[in-house]
Interface confidence: low
């Protein structure tokens, strides 16, 4: 901690400028007025202060604003943002997207730090929902952002924001997250024609129910195997061989390479071997002719 000491004669800082890099820590504490610093925060970033000097400047702002900084100061924190703790950030009220962008820029290229996570949390809670502009901004800086949210948090995403989501933003989402996002995407894209709709909805299909997959199979969509492999197992199991063939189109041949992996493996076990044979892919493991097909979900429920 820097002791409060009288400022030496002639060293009182009239403005925030390069000359301050030559000040000792105690001189910065004594000679830089906190209100002046707040007013000229935008200059701090252009001056090569040491980490120790930045600590002093942070203390001066804390002294002025112990319950949290005003947004005008936050927007110009620059590299001083990296000195903030999550506890500091929880006291902020950030409402401007420009402020959010300015601070995310400081952390660009790095993993999402606890500070950034707290900042985003404060910002989104302040807005009440993840609107399109916010989502656009966050996914631009952190493509995995959407998949870092809990299903509960994702529930506050309005369908209109789904337009901002790119396929790579969903790469790390698990089925529970896609369960929440899929109905929103379905609503967002509902007025598009068939082929355009499929292009947009494809990334979200990991949350699609059986009936929607059946409907898609009637539309000549030619789903690729990578998308098929991400579908919910429980949604794929009730599909018939004919429906899967229509759904995948020319990509159906890829089933052979995936026959030992879920959901293909589990789906094969549910199909009549005769039906599988019609695909001409040599898929094995179906139900032999003459066997009674039980509803496995009922069987599981009873066992």
């Amino acid at each position: 901690e820097v002791e409060k000491t009288a400022c030496p004669s002639g060293k009182k800082a009239p403005e925030i400028d390069e000359s301050l890099i030559f000040y000792k820590k105690w001189e910065l504490e004594a000679c830089v007025d906190a209100a002046l610093l707040a007013t000229q925060m935008d200059r701090v970033n252009a001056i090569p202060f040491t980490y120790e000097q930045l600590d002093v400047l942070k203390h001066k702002l804390d002294e002025l604003y112990p319950q949290g900084y005003p947004e005008s100061v936050i927007q110009h924190l620059g590299y001083l943002f990296l000195k903030m703790s999550p506890e500091d950030i929880r006291k902020w009220n950030v409402t401007s997207l420009e402020t959010l962008k300015a601070l995310l820029e400081v952390n660009k290229g790095h993993e999402m730090s606890p500070q950034v996570a707290t900042l985003i949390d404060r910002f989104v809670k302040g807005r009440g929902q993840l609107d399109k502009d916010t989502l656009d901004t966050l996914t631009a800086f952190y493509p995995g952002y959407l998949c870092s949210l809990s299903p509960e948090e994702l529930s506050s995403v309005p369908p209109s924001s789904i337009w901002a989501v790119r396929p790579q933003d969903l790469d790390t989402c698990d089925p529970r997250q896609l369960d929440v996002l899929y109905p929103k995407a379905r609503l967002a894209f509902q007025n598009m024609n068939g082929s355009e709709y499929f292009v947009k909805i494809q990334s979200f299909l990991g949350g699609a129910p059986t009936e929607d997959l059946k409907a898609l199979s009637q539309q000549n969509v030619s789903m690729d195997l990578a998308t098929f492999m991400k579908l919910r197992t429980d949604a794929v199991l009730p599909l018939t061989v004919a429906e899967v063939q229509k759904l995948l189109g020319p990509h159906v041949e890829g089933l052979k390479a995936e026959e030992r992996h879920r959901p293909v493996r589990d789906w094969i076990l549910r199909q009549r071997q005769d039906d599988l044979d019609t695909l001409g892919l040599g898929l094995q493991g179906g139900i032999p002719n003459g066997y009674l097909v039980l509803d496995l979900s009922m069987q599981e429920a009873l066992s």
Partner: antibody
């Protein structure tokens, strides 16, 4: 030098409303939190609330939630305190302040 | 809310002597940055309050070094060495750690 200039004394009737002003000189208004504090006759100091003029975010003391509204006009560097449903209990000196700078106070008298 | 207690409502003192004024909070005022957010104000008769000490022990600008602040966590002391006539007034402590900001009831410094 920072100066806070408050509006003049006011005499109002019970049940009425009043709007007190506080203009800031010598400081970038958006870089401040403007606080309001009241002092009843022969009493201590009570914190009413504060505003962040950069985004109009305001916070109030529990006692003043339904009594006070703090606003700010950045074009004139002025903070306002609006007090409603006035009673004789609201007779007091009202101060605006910023960190170590206090206004001279506005005396509000509520009387029929 | 954090409750601030100033046990002595008045403190008689002889000019030239030293005096200590105490203040307690019912919750620690220690911030995560290591500072105690305890402020001392003096309100001279007929004037607005003005800041003497901020962050428990830091002298505000223009305040004579006869004033000093100390304490830790929940117990704080304002010490005035060599009391002068101009030091007469009511001394208030205030916590600036969290909302709502709260003041002590004040201690009146009187000359014997």
């Amino acid at each position: 030098e920072v100066q806070l200039q408050q509006s003049g004394a006011d005499l109002v009737k019970p049940g009425a409303s009043v709007k007190l002003s506080c203009t800031v000189f010598g400081l970038n208004f958006k870089d401040t939190f403007m606080h309001w504090v009241r002092q009843r006759p022969e009493q201590g100091l009570e914190w009413i609330g504060r505003i962040d003029p950069a985004n109009d975010n305001s916070i109030y003391g529990p006692k003043f939630q339904d009594k006070a509204t703090i606003t700010a006009d950045t074009s004139s560097n002025t903070a306002y305190l609006h007090l409603s449903s006035l009673t004789s209990e609201d007779t007091a000196v009202y101060y605006c302040l910023y960190f170590d700078n206090w206004g001279h106070g506005t005396t509000l008298t509520v009387s029929s | 809310d954090i409750v601030m207690t100033q046990a002595a409502s008045s403190e008689p003192v002889t000019p030239g002597e030293s005096v200590s004024i105490s203040c307690r909070s019912d919750k620690s005022l220690l911030h995560s940055n290591g500072h105690n957010y305890l402020y001392w104000f003096l309100q001279r008769p007929g004037q607005s309050p003005h800041l003497l000490i901020y962050r428990m022990s830091n002298l505000a600008s223009g305040v004579p070094d006869r004033f000093s602040g100390s304490g830790s966590g929940t117990a704080f002391t304002l010490r005035i060495s060599r009391v002068e006539a101009e030091d007469v007034g009511v001394y208030y402590c205030m916590q600036h750690l969290e909302y709502p900001l709260t003041f002590g009831a004040g201690t009146k410094l009187e000359l014997k």
